[in-house]
């Protein structure tokens, strides 16, 4: 006998990485049928939803109207139908940006290089943080990780065609409050034999970072169905 | 803005009841989800009950159900919370609160956590008396 139902799916939309005082929806999809849904915060009970009709719903949003450092962290989710619980949800790590400083990304040998070459970033911040992370621009929002005291550096190795892109850096204040993102730095990778055109993102994926960046230009919710960033199995 | 300001607090013996008053200024506050939390001499914050911006659903603290009820009334800017059965340990400051007024609630969502309420009145004093 079942005693657990599959666990739904959490995301965050516009965007897993929320400006200060911007709005955030959290979005959790369970069961057509779900009698209740709770949210949970850093392991304890934050918000509750009972849709009505149940059977015609299968997906709730939790509104955050002003993130702040507090509402950062980790959230999860579960559902209810009758009085079968689901599995709770993978962990949707929210995080606040715009925190006090902007730091400095540079490249090195510079933005402009040769397939094969070794490239390396450096992201610097003059304020007490010890952790950075490094971003590019597109569908993955792959985030890397860099410890300084007030630099880190990122070395991507010998370069391909595939790191061409953007890329822009925060400081961390801790996991879940970031700094003001960087001035972006656009790399340039020639000289590929097979390819030297630039290739578009997959279009069938959104660009997680251009719904970031409206979110910083305009505060306003776009209603993208953005999976949060660990993977949903 | 919403300026939240409670009421009916006072001193009741055990077993007996309490009506709680949260008198809300503010256009928005019929569209907002909102609770009653409240504060034991040295004791933390706690979550008491909470009601949807509809009032359809409403959510309660283990220790409170079934002796306590939160209602509102929009057209009159105004929520509740009924206290029966009063215990000596339920002796505190109640507060009510209001979450944020910049989005389109759920008419069914509850917020049990005090981190997510932007507005919160001064705070009523109960005080339950052998």
């Known amino acids: 006998q079942q005693q657990t139902l599959p666990k739904p799916f959490i995301w965050a939309e516009p965007h897993f990485m929320v400006p200060k005082e911007k709005q955030v929806t959290i979005c959790c999809q369970g069961n057509y049928g779900a009698v209740e849904y709770q949210l949970h915060f850093e392991g304890s009970l934050f918000a509750v939803d009972r849709p009505k009709p149940p059977e015609r719903i299968n997906k709730v949003k939790f509104y955050i109207p002003d993130m702040n450092s507090r509402m950062a962290g980790q959230y999860s989710c579960i559902y209810r139908v009758g009085e079968l619980w689901s599995e709770p949800s993978n962990l949707l790590d929210l995080v606040v940006t715009e925190m006090y400083d902007t730091p400095t990304l540079s490249v090195h040998p510079g933005p402009e290089v040769i397939s094969g070459e070794k490239v390396t970033f450096y992201c610097r911040l003059d304020t007490a943080t010890s952790m950075f992370l490094l971003l590019k621009e597109g569908r993955s929002s792959h985030v890397q990780r860099g410890y300084g005291k007030v630099q880190a550096e990122f070395p991507l190795g010998p370069v391909t065609t595939a790191h061409r892109g953007t890329y822009r850096c925060f400081g961390s204040y801790n996991n879940h409050a970031w700094s003001f993102p960087s001035e972006p730095v656009k790399l340039l990778v020639t000289g590929d034999i097979e390819n030297t055109s630039l290739a578009p993102e997959d279009p069938t994926f959104p660009d997680t970072w251009g719904t970031y960046l409206l979110t910083t230009e305009t505060g306003l919710q776009k209603d993208h169905a953005l999976w949060d960033h660990t993977a949903q199995n | 803005q919403v300026q939240l300001v409670e009421s009916g607090g006072g001193l009741v013996q055990a077993g007996g009841s309490l009506r709680l008053l949260c008198a809300a200024s503010g256009r928005t506050f019929s569209r907002l989800p909102m609770a009653w939390f409240r504060q034991g001499p040295g004791k933390d914050r706690e979550f008491v009950a909470a009601i949807s911006w509809s009032g359809g659903s409403t959510y309660y603290a283990d220790s409170m159900k079934g002796r306590f009820t939160i209602s509102r009334d929009n057209a009159k800017n105004t929520a509740y919370l009924q206290m029966n059965s009063l215990r000596l340990e339920d002796t505190a400051v109640y507060y009510c609160?209001?979450?944020?007024?910049?989005?389109?609630?759920?008419?069914?969502?509850?917020?049990?956590?005090?981190?997510?309420?932007?507005?919160w009145g001064q705070g009523t004093q109960v005080t339950v008396s052998s």
């Open positions: 609160a209001a979450v944020g007024d910049s989005a389109p609630y759920s008419a069914t969502i509850v917020y049990t956590d005090a981190r997510a309420y932007a507005y």
